[in-house]
Interface confidence: medium
């Protein structure tokens, strides 16, 4: 028989981790593997039909994607949808496929909302998801004794899929649920330096453990301003939520990773500022199969998709699509063996959930909600060389933090700063001397109202739903 996979991904724009130029070669490799294995879908031919999730402008679209999905559904009656990856594109498609009872498999759609499988029934996420980042951050807080307060800053990028908005959403909700701590969150506009200064004054009043989701350049600028403002690593720690490790990518990712370095005359200060910085990324798979897969992926992309694939963590997404597709093929094979059909979406999906699988990305564990357990790395600066290296890995399956031998977290005072200052944020503890700004003076300098619409405390409601800003 014939089994049709309907692809709804960006076909023209190659900048997304789930662009077809990146995922296409991974699909080819997965299908070649299915064909080569007699135990997978024996007697079946798998074909792909392509549809774009982009608007005419070449960006992810919450209008184009569902229209494409409808066209593919009625024209080809696919057994499974692959993609979309973008949050705004995946949301309506996921609701349609749930209604049609057709499985949707993606390695994108990382937003918290897709975890609601009542709304997104039969949606399986074989890639990372932001709630899992919250698991990592919660484990980190437990390890370091931060159980009261955290602050999250995130950049608003107009006309975008709002990656930082959704990263923060997953982190915020999961950390709050896991630890029952206070998590404040502030949105800011990238590029507005005056605003950054105001932002850092708020930081002084609201946090010592700060998570920042922004571009590498913005993070560096904020670190420089923090140094200028006296927010040093003795009292503060700034985590850059740089999941794909863009700030760590030197030439081919092999040079010493110095995210503070720009050769712009500010490197000395930036180096000093980054003593207070740490970077959170996805963990690069370290199994030999992944390296071998990357080699094939890159060559296939170049020869058959006319696309030159760079090195980096972004390649874990095509790899996750590859593993997801093989997991799907396994689930269909099992469903058929038990008398089911390729259109039995519920049965196929259930066979993909709550199971482990050895893929090119290594050991892959799907949770009982159909979302992949995700591994993360924490990078810290070697004070000797200024190079960042992995000091801790988080194993999503075991929920354990694993230290990298020979590498320790670098704290200027030899220990992590407390998440709440000894005397409170406003020196409110009467036992302490009022040697910093008083509450009144601080409020005169800045209030939430002063920041106007640019700095908006996001509500839980916002974090649950996929609203454009």
């Amino acid at each position: 028989g014939n089994l049709t996979v309907a692809v709804v991904l960006p076909l023209a724009n190659t900048s997304y981790p789930w662009s077809w130029a990146r995922v296409g070669p991974a699909v080819e490799l997965a299908l070649a593997k299915v064909k080569a294995r007699p135990d997978l879908l024996p007697g079946w031919t798998v074909r792909t039909v392509l549809g774009s999730s982009e608007s005419a402008l070449g960006v992810c679209s919450d209008t184009a994607a569902p229209l494409t999905a409808v066209d593919l559904k009625w024209e080809h009656n696919p057994a499974v949808f692959l993609g979309p990856g973008c949050v705004y594109a995946a949301a309506p498609v996921g609701r349609f496929t749930a209604h049609w009872r057709v499985p949707l498999l993606t390695a994108g759609a990382p937003a918290l909302g897709f975890g609601a499988k009542d709304e997104y029934a039969l949606t399986t996420r074989a890639g990372p998801s932001h709630a899992k980042l919250g698991d990592f951050v919660a484990a980190l807080h437990r390890r370091l004794g931060w159980e009261r307060q955290a602050l999250v800053l995130y950049a608003y990028q107009p006309g975008d899929d709002q990656p930082c908005f959704f990263v923060v959403g997953g982190l915020y909700m999961r950390v709050r649920d896991r630890l029952n701590i206070t998590v404040d969150h502030l949105e800011f506009a990238e590029g507005d330096r005056d605003h950054y200064t105001l932002l850092l004054r708020t930081v002084r009043r609201k946090g010592r453990v700060i998570y920042i989701c922004s571009s590498p350049d913005t993070f560096r600028t904020l670190m420089l301003l923090a140094l200028e403002a006296g927010l040093s690593g003795e009292d503060y720690v700034f985590f850059h939520l740089d999941l794909f490790g863009h700030s760590l990518q030197g030439a081919h990712g092999l040079v010493p990773r110095r995210p503070w370095e720009r050769e712009d005359g500010q490197d000395v200060s930036a180096h000093q500022a980054f003593q207070a910085a740490k970077i959170i990324t996805y963990k690069e798979p370290d199994n030999p199969e992944y390296l071998e897969f990357l080699r094939k992926l890159k060559h296939l992309a170049r020869e058959q998709f006319n696309f030159t694939m760079e090195d980096g963590l972004v390649n874990t997404i095509p790899a996750a699509f590859h593993d997801g597709l093989l997991l799907y093929a396994q689930a269909v094979t099992e469903t058929l063996a038990h008398g089911g059909t390729v259109t039995d979406g519920e049965s196929i999906t259930q066979r993909m959930w709550n199971r482990s699988f050895q893929g090119v990305t290594g050991y892959l564990k799907m949770d009982s909600n159909g979302d992949r357990e995700t591994d993360f790395s924490l990078w810290d600066m070697d004070p000797e060389t200024g190079a960042f290296r992995v000091v801790l890995n988080f194993n999503g399956t075991s929920q354990e933090l694993v230290t990298v031998s020979g590498h320790t977290l670098n704290w200027p005072l030899g220990h992590p700063p407390p998440d709440v200052p000894r005397c409170g944020f406003d020196n409110e503890d009467p036992a302490c001397n009022q040697d910093h700004f008083s509450t009144l003076e601080e409020q005169k300098l800045i209030s939430e109202e002063d920041l106007g619409g640019e700095q908006k405390l996001i509500s839980e409601e916002d974090l649950h739903h996929h609203h454009h800003h």
Epitope: A251, H252, L291, L294, N306
Partner: antibody
Framework: EVQLVESGGGLVQPGGSLRLSCAAS????????MGWVRQAPGKGLEWVSS????????YYADPVKGRFTISRDNSKNTLYLQMNSLRAEDTAAYYC?????????????WGQGTLVTVSS | AIQMTQSPSSLSASVGDRVTITCRSS??????FGWYQQKPGKAPKLLIY???RLQSGVPSRFSGSGSGTDFTLTINNLQPEDFATYYC?????????FGPGTKVDIK
């Protein structure tokens, strides 16, 4: 059994042209990237050119760019190298090579080579 | 273009010896790298691909290691048929480039 048989080599004057052919058998020709590697007498190996299975992509080494053209005829399972404006330094044995992108095996099959001599 | 340097350019060894040849690339090439053996008058033969993967049919006394910029070919228990010239190749990016070769001859 995979076989690659080159032909078309010979003696040619500087500035002249030659067309090399490589007849392939024993594998799915269209699925493979094909290429040419040369070796000057007593010297090392030098990659010359490659072409993808779908004909869309061609690549050339700097010394031959603009003078050599790689092509293939998938219906005839044949690879070609059109060499124009030949120079003395193009004198070499030219090998036809395969590259299976699904396995990642680069240049795993080689022909026996055809000798091109550029001399006046 | 990426430059490949190979060392030594030649070496003399005896049957049963352990031989090590190294290759260095001018920039990081991950594991997009291979080793070839060529005997006089013959076409080269692929020994190792992806830096450390043994091509099928190649004896297990050949092994490859390395990633990034530094790569090694090791021949354990050198056999008479192993006396040949060995070339490394980067296929990380076009133009592909070979190393200058290492000639292994009988001591």
């Amino acid at each position: 059994e995979v076989q690659l048989v080159e032909s078309g080599g010979g003696l040619v004057q500087p500035g002249g042209s030659l067309r090399l052919s490589c007849a392939a058998s024993g594998f799915s020709f269209v699925s493979y990237v094909m290429g040419w590697v040369r070796q000057a007498p007593g010297k090392g190996l030098e990659w010359v050119s490659s072409i993808s299975g779908s004909l869309t992509n061609t690549y050339y080494a700097d010394p031959v760019k603009g003078r050599f053209t790689i092509s293939r005829d998938n219906s005839k399972n044949t690879l070609y190298l059109q060499m124009n404006s030949l120079r003395a330094e193009d004198t070499a044995a030219y090998y036809c090579v395969t590259y299976d992108i699904l396995t990642g095996h680069l240049f795993d099959y080689w022909g026996q080579g055809t000798l091109v001599t550029v001399s006046s | 273009a990426i430059q490949m340097t190979q060392s030594p350019s030649s070496l003399s060894a005896s049957v049963g010896d352990r031989v090590t040849i190294t290759c260095r690339s001018s920039q990081g090439i991950r594991n997009d790298f291979g080793w070839y053996q060529q005997k006089p008058g013959k076409a080269p033969k692929l020994l190792i691909y992806a830096a450390s993967r043994l091509q099928s049919g190649v004896p297990s006394r050949f092994s490859g290691s390395g990633s990034g910029t530094d790569f090694t070919l090791t021949i354990n228990n050198l056999q008479p048929e192993d006396f040949a010239t060995y070339y490394c190749l980067q296929d990380y990016t076009y133009p592909f480039t070979f190393g200058p070769g290492t000639k292994v001859d009988i001591k």
